[in-house]
Interface confidence: low
């Protein structure tokens, strides 16, 4: 006769492992007992369990509650056992030793492989700011057995680097994604993709990029100089900029306080019916946590009673 088993049995952490051992004997042969042992134990074989043809299943105290026979119906020549709830420490070599009558003893070995699926973690790098050089955007770490594969899925241009740390029964893989921050990356997804034989599908963790920036400021409203004349209603200046985080706006007058009646509404400066008192240099100050910008304009309100023309100067400063 001979033993039928598998070279390798592979299970995922927490699953039940069936350790196969079937004696294919000649007619009239019987299996007296089947002994299962860890064959890679440091101090000789460590018995797991023994299937006795008369006295049934005996389980080592170290495996109490974890070793069972497959559910019925059972073939008396089948010495397979179930190892419940496989853990990493179960990985290794196992030996099945079958004692038969009258043919004697047979033994076979198999290797149990326990896959430990990773639980990946994504850690964003330091705050991204426009103008920085190559900067860490995020790192992704996954630990498993065997070592997982960690890659990145993104439209963003960048560079990746990976490193691996081997532990006694697993390996941790860390991949870093570096980029040169630009405002166009704002809101773009950066996805860490972890592949592993113990996963039914890749695990994906998405991080949304936030890049701090502040655009140059400019002021709109003075495009048609002839509209800025005494008596005109609804005149307004609008400060234009954009940033991340969204900026706040502040209006001042360089050559004195804001005239009475002038309303500040965020990025907009609203004027009452214009008088020559409204002539002056107005400054829009734009700021966020990242930076600040100024833009100033000269308003010259035309008095139709006078012949003098109106001039408008625009100056931007950072």
């Amino acid at each position: 006769g001979e033993l039928e088993t598998s070279d390798v049995v592979t299970v995922v952490l927490g699953q039940d492992a069936k350790l196969p051992c079937f004696y294919r004997g000649d007619s009239g042969e019987q299996v007296g007992q089947v002994a299962w042992a860890r064959a890679d134990a440091g101090e000789g074989a460590q018995e797991l369990a023994l299937l006795h043809s008369k006295y049934g299943l005996h389980v080592s105290p170290a495996y109490e509650g974890r070793v069972e026979q497959p559910p019925p119906p059972r073939n008396p020549l089948d010495g397979s056992v179930l190892l419940r709830n496989a853990v990493q420490a179960d990985e290794g070599e196992y030996e099945c030793r079958v004692s038969t009558f009258p043919a004697g003893s047979f033994q076979a070995r198999l290797r149990l492989r326990v896959l430990v699926p990773p639980l990946p973690s994504l850690n964003p790098g330091p705050a991204l700011e426009e103008g920085q050089g190559l900067t860490l955007a995020a790192s992704c770490t996954a630990e498993g057995s065997p070592a997982p594969s960690v890659t990145w899925d993104t439209e963003v241009k960048g560079t990746t680097s990976s490193r691996s740390f081997k532990h006694s029964r697993s390996a941790a893989v860390t991949s870093e994604f570096h980029l040169v921050p630009s405002r166009s990356m704002n809101g773009q997804p950066l996805t860490c993709v972890v592949s592993h034989p113990g996963l039914l599908q890749d695990q994906r963790i998405t991080h949304i990029l936030h890049v701090s920036f502040l655009a140059e400021a400019s002021v709109r409203g003075l495009e048609d100089q002839n509209l800025w004349h005494v008596g005109r209603e609804g005149a307004m200046l609008k400060c234009l900029s954009e940033g991340q985080p969204p900026p706040s706006y502040n209006w001042t007058r360089l050559d004195g306080p804001l005239p009475s009646g002038v309303r500040v509404d965020g990025d907009t400066l609203g004027f009452p019916p214009l008088t020559t008192e409204h002539s002056g240099i107005y400054v829009c100050h734009v700021s966020n946590e990242f930076s600040s910008r100024d833009s100033q304009v000269t308003v010259d309100v035309l008095d139709p009673q006078e012949d003098s023309g109106k001039q408008v100067d625009l100056v931007s400063a950072s």
Partner: nanobody
Amino acid sequence: EVQLVESGGGLVQAGGSLRLSCAASGSISSINLMGWHRQAPGKQRELVATITRGGSTNYADSVKGRFTISRDNGKNTVYLQMNSLKPEDTAAYYCVDVEPSGMGWRDYWGQGTQVTVSS
């Protein structure tokens, strides 16, 4: 061994909000999962939401769009922001910390915090 302490439960009117917190201490691993379950009187305990160390989330269909789970890895704390609360959200809310152990994965549970939503 892991200890969990929940807080933030209470009585709130329908449509209101509450924020639950759960602080974990003890042997916290680098690959743990944290989350919230709830148990209404006379019903089985059900999953509400879970979150990985990297911020990936999973929600029960009944709370999607209303509840938000978050965590502070540095403080080993998980939060559950509950908005647009409904009377059917009334339950004891239990924090769970899922740790690798010799037998696969082990769940550690908090004592629970009561959330009551009145109509």
